[in-house]
Interface confidence: medium
């Protein structure tokens, strides 16, 4: 669906300003912060969402061990620079001229430097591992039911093609969702795994980005799946470049 005509809102992004000023009086929505027009029939890019957030008032059953090159977003929020298509620019700088290189999900992948720092290309994050711990339940969830519900969630809520959900692992109380999407696999119109993971992360935290939705209520055979802790690991097509000082810290 597109932006709702009746009250002119963006179903997939509440951090927008919408008005019926599109062609033929159609509802058109622009992201807060950047003012960029967004497609309300799909997820908004993480870069535009972060920018809007900063502008707003305030198959084996074994678990996966993240690769030594996996990144975790330890830097938190920042006001990113986005390209004309809404993607992260490879180089990000703050107001004090400190710069760093990021991957396609906006996570820093180099040491911080000055304005002379070069980031030749935006390196794609092709593998995302979402690590969840759920609240204690009377018994473990049935793995196949859990797997089916999470795959359905990503397919229907986040519109992510099922082929990009590589695996769902479960060892009570830990759930791991593996998303994989190489540059060559991603066709025009495909939702990016980084955007889907970000929407999921916000949903899990009770901060839904969807218009008029209270929060994620994920159920497995009727029992609410309540997440206590979330960790997301990002693996890039090219390993990150950090100094040994950071790696041994």
């Amino acid at each position: 669906h597109t932006a709702a005509q009746d009250n002119c809102t963006c179903p997939t992004n509440k951090m927008t300003v919408c008005s019926p000023d599109g062609p033929g009086g159609r509802c058109q929505c622009r992201a807060l912060g950047s003012g960029m027009a967004v497609d309300c029939s799909t997820l908004t890019s993480k870069c535009l969402l972060l920018k809007a957030r900063m502008s707003a008032p305030k198959n084996a059953r074994t678990l996966v061990r993240p690769s030594e090159h996996a990144l975790v977003d330890n830097d938190g929020l920042y006001d990113p620079d986005c390209d004309p298509e809404g993607r992260f620019k490879a180089r990000q700088c703050n107001q004090t001229s400190v710069c760093w290189c990021v991957n396609s999900v906006g996570v820093r992948r180099t040491d911080k430097g000055d304005l002379s720092l070069r980031c030749d290309e935006l390196v794609r994050t092709h593998h995302i591992l979402i690590d969840l711990r759920h609240r204690p339940t009377a018994g473990a969830f049935n793995h196949s039911d859990l797997d089916a519900e999470l795959r359905r969630l990503f397919r229907e809520r986040y519109r992510l093609h099922p082929k990009f959900v590589a695996a769902v692992h479960y060892e009570q109380p830990t759930i791991q969702i593996e998303l994989r999407q190489n540059t060559s696999q991603k066709a025009a119109g495909d939702v990016d795994i980084g955007d889907a993971a970000y929407y999921f992360e916000r949903d899990i935290k009770g901060e839904s980005l969807f218009q008029g939705r209270g929060g994620l209520d994920l159920r497995v055979r009727g029992e609410p799946l309540q997440v206590e802790r979330t960790l997301i690991y990002y693996l890039d097509e090219i390993p990150p470049k950090f100094s040994m000082k950071r790696l041994t810290a």
């Epitope: 229907e156 935290k205 209270g214 929060g215 609410p224 309540q226």
Partner: antibody
Amino acid sequence: QVQLKESGPGLVAPSETLSITCTVSGFSLTSYGVNWIRQPPGKGLEWLGVMWAGGSTNYNSALMSRLTISKDTSKNQVSLKLSSVQAADTAMYYCARDENWDGAWFAYWGQGTLVTVSS
Amino acid sequence: DIVMTQSPSSLAVSLGERATMSCKSSQSLLNSGTRKNYLAWYQQKPGQPPKLLISWASSRESGVPDRFSGSGSGTDFTLTISSVQAEDLAVYYCKQSYNLFTFGGGTKVEIK
């Protein structure tokens, strides 16, 4: 737009099986769950059971032994069967859509079908 | 099973007056992860199916007048109508969805 419509026999004899169908339009039964709720005349609401989008079911524990909920996705229908009915099962029977992952709220209801158990 | 208890069972108020009703659950409905409560309020007018008013204990649904407000957390919840209008004559039900679903017995709002 989203619509749910219950259809039932109106009158059922004691000890027989009550069968009601909920026909939906405007959404897919593979994307949303459908709940059954009943309301005896002049009384409150009682949740009976749910057919989840994935095809699994849950029932009110007090009625589990008598209740069966099934669906035919191709016909956009969810069916309720309640066996060994008695006068206490006389009620308005509603089906309602579960709002999926946005909280298990019932935002869309059918108008209900009145079922009387009497000989 | 979670038991939902509503009080009072009926409430007579004058037009323009405030109406307050209570709903108590036999166990906490709070999701500690998202800090949200699995509780909804429904309004049922005579001869009609129920209508969703409030979700997540305090989130008013689209189109619901702002005189309706929900509050509370854990096991104790309240629905308040700040200034009762004639069209608010109805029965109000709370419903938990923390563990499947249970409705409260309802509170009937009548006009004095």
